[in-house]
């Protein structure tokens, strides 16, 4: 999906209002400095591409983020403010329908959510103080 035509201001507002709080709750008890930055983004559409990938694509060590509250809200926000996004996600949603018991949060999932927080921070601000 090409995130170029999303309403970035609306997505930013949703992030600040709800998604950020859910991410921070998930990370509670963990310092952001506990993990080094392993993923970056270079403009707002690129940030959303990487946020989508980290949030919804299962990885071998952290398979269940898509079921978390912040992920559901992220999906709703992208569907609301990115034209045509929800249509591209129908197949992915059907694949996720079989729900399992939520696993205990692993260190790898904490690391992944730490990277997500970093990507969102890059998305919501004009990154560089100058230039």
């Amino acid at each position: 999906y090409d995130f170029t035509n999303c309403d970035f201001q609306k997505i930013e507002a949703d992030y600040l209002r709800t998604i950020s709080k859910d991410l921070i709750t998930y990370m509670s008890g963990t310092k952001s400095t506990d993990f080094n930055n392993t993923v970056s983004c270079s403009n707002r559409p690129h940030c959303l591409t990487e946020i989508q990938s980290l949030t919804f694509n299962p990885t071998p060590r952290c398979a269940s983020l898509a079921k978390e509250m912040f992920a559901r809200k992220t999906k709703a926000t992208l569907a609301l403010w990115c034209p045509g996004y929800s249509e591209t996600q129908i197949n992915a949603t059907q694949a996720m329908k079989k729900r399992r018991k939520r696993k205990v949060t692993t260190n790898k999932c904490l690391e992944q959510v730490s990277q997500l927080l970093g990507l969102w921070r890059r998305f919501i601000r004009t990154l560089l103080k100058k230039q």
Epitope: N36, T38, S42, L127, L128, Q131
Partner: antibody, heavy 122, light 108 residues
Framework: QMQLVESGGGVVQPGRSLRLSCAAS????????MHWVRQAPGKGLEWVAV????????HYADSVKGRFTITRDNSKNTLNLQMNSLRAEDTAVYYC???????????????WGQGTMVTVSS | SYVLTQPPSVSVAPGQTARITCGGN??????VHWYQQKPGQAPVLVVY???DRPSWIPERFSGSNSGNTATLTISRGEAGDEADYYC???????????FGGGTKLTVL
């Protein structure tokens, strides 16, 4: 463990070519800008080139423009520097480094490789 | 193109404060980054965006930037701080990375 490992250095005659490589691991390579920086023996750091995270755009120092080419393969997590028409003044340790970027602005180089030595001598 | 000027050397007594300057035309309008390099080793980022510090760098390292001068401050100097220090900016008009000439810090 985030890591950059350079290879390909060696001794080469003036006018000849050499290709350096940098293998990245432990981070999402395709999301970072990547640089080559060199350091002549006993001298300071000299920036050589940078390539955008996407590989679509490159920038070079005047001293290497037209002779050196920076490329990347995001599917293999590798960065390359093709060095042609080498001169004695290209003798240096060559480092690769990663840099987040925002639009067309590159930020600090937060991870560096250990370097590979290139000696241009007849 | 843009030029950054550093003093070739700075000395500090153990436990005292060292200040390394980096001069450039209106450098205060740019983000300055500082690197430490010990002999035979790769550079290490110690301060970025004028005054921010990577999580692995001690609080003794700090930075400031205004006008035509950026400054790296190392408080409570230790023998392990002996190294070459380089300032760096991104020149967005010429699309170039620019390094200062480097400053050798000696802890007496």
């Amino acid at each position: 463990q985030m890591q950059l490992v350079e290879s390909g250095g060696g001794v080469v005659q003036p006018g000849r070519s050499l290709r350096l490589s940098c293998a990245a691991s432990g981070f999402t390579f395709r999301t970072y800008g990547m640089h080559w920086v060199r350091q002549a023996p006993g001298k300071g750091l000299e920036w050589v080139a940078v390539i955008w995270y996407s590989g679509t755009t490159t920038h070079y120092a005047d001293s290497v423009k037209g002779r050196f080419t920076i490329t990347r393969d995001n599917s293999k997590n590798t960065l390359n520097l093709q060095m042609n028409s080498l001169r004695a003044e290209d003798t240096a340790v060559y480092y690769c480094s990663r840099s987040p970027q925002w639009e067309d602005i590159f930020e600090s180089m937060d991870i560096w490789g250990q370097g590979t030595m290139v000696t241009v001598s007849s | 193109s843009y030029v950054l000027t550093q003093p070739p050397s700075v000395s500090v007594a153990p436990g005292q404060t060292a200040r390394i300057t980096c001069g450039g035309n209106n450098i205060g309008s740019k983000n300055v980054h500082w690197y430490q390099q010990k002999p035979g080793q790769a550079p290490v980022l110690v301060v970025y965006d004028d005054s921010d510090r990577p999580s692995w760098i001690p609080e003794r390292f700090s930075g400031s930037n205004s006008g035509n001068t950026a400054t790296l401050t190392i408080s409570r100097g230790e023998a392990g701080d002996e190294a070459d220090y380089y300032c760096q900016v991104w020149d967005s008009s010429d699309f170039l990375v620019v390094f200062g000439g480097g400053t050798k810090l000696t802890v007496l």
